[in-house]
């Protein structure tokens, strides 16, 4: 629990005063003010927005607010020449287009500025062809097409369904494979829960729903055009043929009603198994091209859009700390949306808005925080994270050393289930201690504590009585300050049953269809939900801004890393001939876990009887707490990939949201009876389980007694 | 398009040492190992050993004391040595690029005869 | 690991279905099964690899199948062109072997 140091505080300044301030119905009527009209990023409306923002923050009583600004690459639309697919015959004419845009939903008729579905980033192109369904493009499918089935993608368009992972992993995997297009598409199986309607009479993708999104490949770059540095008045711009990460093909979404129209035609190869058959009726043949009577028509795609520099804005809110207001607890959302952002963002913009107010409240009623708190309204998250790491990038000498923490506080919620947290495993016991003090909002679990059930709903698989806490991947705002800067962080947001639900991420993400009323009438109507939420998000930010000893457990990351060690050595042993061959030797990397897990041990033991009141030691723990996650950096970033430095964690090379663990090891190993040179390959793994044991062994010296 | 090309005495007196090199093009010595391979007249295959692009070398254990394989990257050039030769070492002899596990190019081999 | 390649010699005729097969003596990785043909006076090519993955150039009728110990290349419908010796080829930690061959001949 956090104490109540003397810092202008009256008992009841403590988290239970922040907690109470949080209200459901200023949640529910902040997001119906923020998802009124769409705000791309890049557009006026989303700069008046953040206008509103900075005043409204203002108002509830923070020390300072001002919007940071950037001008980084961007990509629209053509207004005047839109992107569309056809079939063409023989010919050369279009005997079927897609459609141009999304029917609008009840309501929202008459709104302007809706932007089509569109690939951001994608070239623009007119590339025609056969077609090859490639399942979810993921590289496990093409393995199965390219070396099991033998078929070349090389000068085809592919076809692949949205799902399982970030669809900038699908087009590099195309374009790896050299397809010289990318039609992106929902598939129901992924987007259509089963008992459910279709909007607006439900919570499920219409036919013509489409998901926007960006297909860039930037692992961390932030804008293209200024890596490593901010796209400020005076950066220095990378020509377009040597910016980071854009595709090289065009790419272009569609709904499933478009998709079966292409899909149905198809010919070739039957789908290998049942794991490549969706929901809709068509035989999910691979190709190449169509079958015997369609054999003659291609696939063309009109892809016009344009990359433009373009000023973007975030707000960053200061509520200066009274102890130590050199130390920096940020908690972050994007406030940039596809259109109307009813979930993505702005259901994590209104309750971090309402958290906001809260500790306004306190403050005006003489409060501080021990430490300082940042509150930030990232702009372009959803063009790559670009609002975010260009501010990071700006200030990361400041963040480098005074970066206590990061939450993330995009999407409130994905489903009404149970909670899903993704954070370091410093924050672990935080988020377990904060959990057990908050009341579950989850039917049957009345006067239970969110914890029971979310650990009922959502189990860990390795210990059991304890919640599952998933790693952090990328995909959104934390990325730079845990990925780059080695900065504490976690997420949490409610989420839905995954055993029961296997879509992919909830079947509104980023289309028209994603408003206010989605929220309120299908998934959150008491916004109890979101309460929750803003109580974790808050209650969490409240502690590590607060409590007089950092709420961190160093043992806990002891533990991950022994089962980490364990997972990678196991994976490796796959190989045993080669092993030995090589003498390939994980014993260092234990060697240190085990010096780490001794070392975090001691230092736990000092941490619970020091002189708190000794303001130069109870700094000193607490820089070593701060700074552990820093220890876990390299400078030099991981192959290919400078911009994540983190030894421990990245984000996976296939999947840009979900989290790998010793991500040099695993990269060095994967597909290593493929690699041409076994002996580089296998020099390249002990290379990597040497940068992983000298880390591991570096930081584990920063927790020693200093003297 | 990959060859690969030996050259190589043809003669050798018994207990002198052999000496091939293998000259490749259309492929980087960074990139790819090469084995070397031997058929005596009549025979099938027997492996001798592998030089990899990080410079690493295995050998076949029963002719590790009497072989070498060095290269230069920078030439494109892989040199096999082989010390003691005896008239059962007499064969023909191939380089072949590397792959994995597997030799995907060969030279047209070099006809080593050791007699006095 | 000795690979153990038989028959040591056969003869088929056009048309007719050729399988040779490899035995091992330990067990080996499907990823690292090769088989190579070689003709009279000329380099041996790589025919098969990993198994069962037809070399660029290599005709359909070709295949190869099999696992731990044993394995196979057949030949659906045999040419006159086909008429070669195919060794067989293996990684189970150095040295790499090779079998000692199956003539095929025409009858």
């Known amino acids: 629990k956090s104490s109540n140091e003397a810092t202008n505080i009256t008992p009841k300044h403590n988290m239970k005063a922040f907690l109470d301030e949080l209200k459901a119905e200023n949640i529910k009527k902040f997001l119906y003010n923020f998802t009124q009209i769409p705000h791309l990023a890049g557009t006026e409306q989303n700069f008046q927005l953040a206008k509103q923002i900075q005043s409204q923050w203002k108002e509830f009583g923070l020390d300072s607010v001002e919007l940071a600004h950037y001008d980084v690459l961007l990509s629209y639309p053509n207004k005047t020449h839109p992107n569309y697919i056809s079939i063409i015959n023989e010919d050369g004419n279009e005997i079927f287009n897609t459609s141009l845009f999304e029917p609008p939903p009840p309501g929202y008729e008459n709104v302007s500025d809706i932007v089509p579905p569109f690939s951001a980033f994608s070239p623009q192109g007119m590339p025609e062809g056969d077609l090859v369904y490639v399942n979810y493009a993921r590289t496990e499918d093409f393995f199965k097409l390219e070396r099991d089935m033998k078929i070349n993608c090389s000068g085809k368009i592919v076809i692949a369904r949205y799902g399982k992972v970030f669809r900038g992993n699908k087009v590099k995997n195309a374009q790896l494979a050299g397809a010289k297009g990318v039609i992106l598409y929902s598939d129901p199986a992924d987007y259509f829960a089963p008992g459910v309607k279709s909007y607006p009479d439900g919570w499920n993708l219409p036919g013509g729903g489409v998901q926007r999104g960006n297909i860039l490949n930037l692992n961390g770059a932030g804008d293209p055009l200024t890596p490593g540095y901010p796209a400020n008045e005076y950066a220095y711009r990378r020509g377009i043929a040597e910016a980071v990460g854009l595709p090289s093909i065009p790419v272009h979404p569609i709904g499933y009603y478009d998709a079966q129209k292409l899909l149905e035609k198809m010919g070739g190869s039957a789908p290998p198994d049942s794991s490549w058959r969706g929901s809709l009726k068509v035989p999910y043949n691979v190709g190449p091209g169509f079958t015997g009577n369609f054999s003659t028509q291609k696939v063309k795609m009109h892809i016009h859009s344009t990359n433009e520099v373009t000023r973007i804005y975030n707000v960053i809110g200061t509520l200066r700390g009274a102890v130590e207001p050199d130390r920096y607890v940020i908690l972050g959302g994007h406030r940039d949306s596809w259109v109307f952002g009813g979930i993505d963002p702005q259901s994590g913009a209104a309750v971090v808005h309402e958290i906001v107010r809260s500790f306004g409240t306190l403050k005006k009623e003489g409060w501080r925080p021990r430490r300082t708190i940042l509150f930030a309204s990232w702009d372009a998250e959803e063009f790559g994270l670009l609002g975010s790491t260009e501010w990071a990038e700006e200030n990361s000498r400041l963040l480098q050393e005074r970066g206590v923490a990061y939450i993330n506080a995009d999407s409130s919620i994905e489903g009404n289930y149970t909670l899903r947290v993704d954070c370091t495993p410093l924050m672990y016991s935080l988020v377990h201690n904060l959990t057990k003090e908050l009341k579950s909002p989850d039917e049957g679990f009345e006067g239970k504590s969110l914890y029971e059930s979310w650990t009922k709903k959502s189990p860990s698989p390795e210990f059991s009585g304890m919640p599952r806490i998933s790693k952090l991947g990328s995909g959104n705002d934390f990325e730079v300050f845990f990925q780059r800067l080695g900065i504490a962080s976690g997420r949490a947001r409610y989420t839905k049953n995954w055993e029961t639900n296997k879509f992919s991420g909830y079947p509104l993400y980023h289309s028209v269809y994603e408003t206010y009323e989605l929220v309120e009438k299908f998934y959150d109507p008491m916004f109890k939900y979101h309460l929750t939420v803003a109580q974790v998000r808050g209650g969490m930010v409240f502690e590590l801004a607060n409590s007089i000893v950092l709420p961190f457990d160093c043992r806990d990351y002891a533990v991950v890393l022994r089962k980490y060690a364990d997972k990678i050595y196991s994976i490796s042993m796959k190989h045993p001939q080669e092993m030995k061959t090589y003498s390939v030797s994980f014993d260092s990397l234990f060697s240190a876990v085990k010096n780490f897990t001794e070392i975090a041990s001691k230092f736990s033991e000092r941490l619970q009887d020091f002189d708190k009141s000794n303001p130069i030691v109870l700094r000193m723990m607490n820089d070593q707490l701060m700074f552990l996650e820093r220890a876990f950096i390299d400078p030099l970033g991981l192959p290919d990939r400078p911009f994540y430095r983190h030894v421990i964690y990245a984000p996976s090379s296939h999947n840009k949201y979900a989290g790998e663990s010793f991500p040099g090891i695993y990269d060095a190993l994967f597909d290593i009876e493929s690699k041409v040179d076994p002996s580089k390959a296998w020099g390249e793994v002990k290379r990597q389980i040497y940068v992983a044991a000298f880390t591991v062994q570096a930081a584990a010296e920063t927790l020693s007694e200093v003297a | 398009s990959v060859k690969l090309q030996e050259s190589g005495p043809g003669l050798v007196a018994p207990s002198q040492s052999l000496s091939i090199t293998c000259t490749v093009s259309?492929?980087?010595?960074?990139?790819?190992?090469v084995s070397w391979i031997r058929q005596p007249p009549g025979k099938g295959l027997e492996w001798l050993g592998v030089i990899w692009s990080d410079g690493n070398t295995y050998y076949n254990s029963p002719l590790k004391s009497r072989l070498s394989i060095n290269k230069d990257n920078s030439k494109s050039q892989v040199f096999l040595k082989m010390n003691s030769l005896q008239t059962d070492d007499s064969a023909m002899y191939y380089c072949?690029?590397?792959?994995?596990?597997?030799?995907?190019?060969w030279g047209q081999g070099t006809s080593v005869t050791v007699s006095s | 690991t000795v690979l153990t390649q038989s028959p040591a010699i056969m003869s088929a005729s056009p048309g007719e279905k050729v399988t040779m097969t490899c035995r091992a003596s330990?067990?080996?990785?499907?990823?690292?099964l090769h088989w190579y043909q070689q003709k009279s006076s000329a380099s041996p090519k790589l025919w098969i690899y990993r198994t069962s993955n037809l070399a660029s150039g290599v005709p359909a009728r070709f295949s190869g199948s099999g696992s731990g110990t044993s394995y196979s290349l057949t030949i659906s419908s045999l040419e006159a062109e086909d008429a070669a010796t195919y060794y067989c080829q293996q990684y189970s930690g150095y040295p790499l072997t090779f079998g000692a061959g199956t003539k095929l001949e025409l009858k």
């Open positions: 072949a690029r590397h792959k994995v596990y597997t030799m995907d190019y």
């Open positions: 259309g492929f980087s010595l960074t990139d790819y190992g």
């Open positions: 330990s067990s080996v990785s499907s990823s690292y």
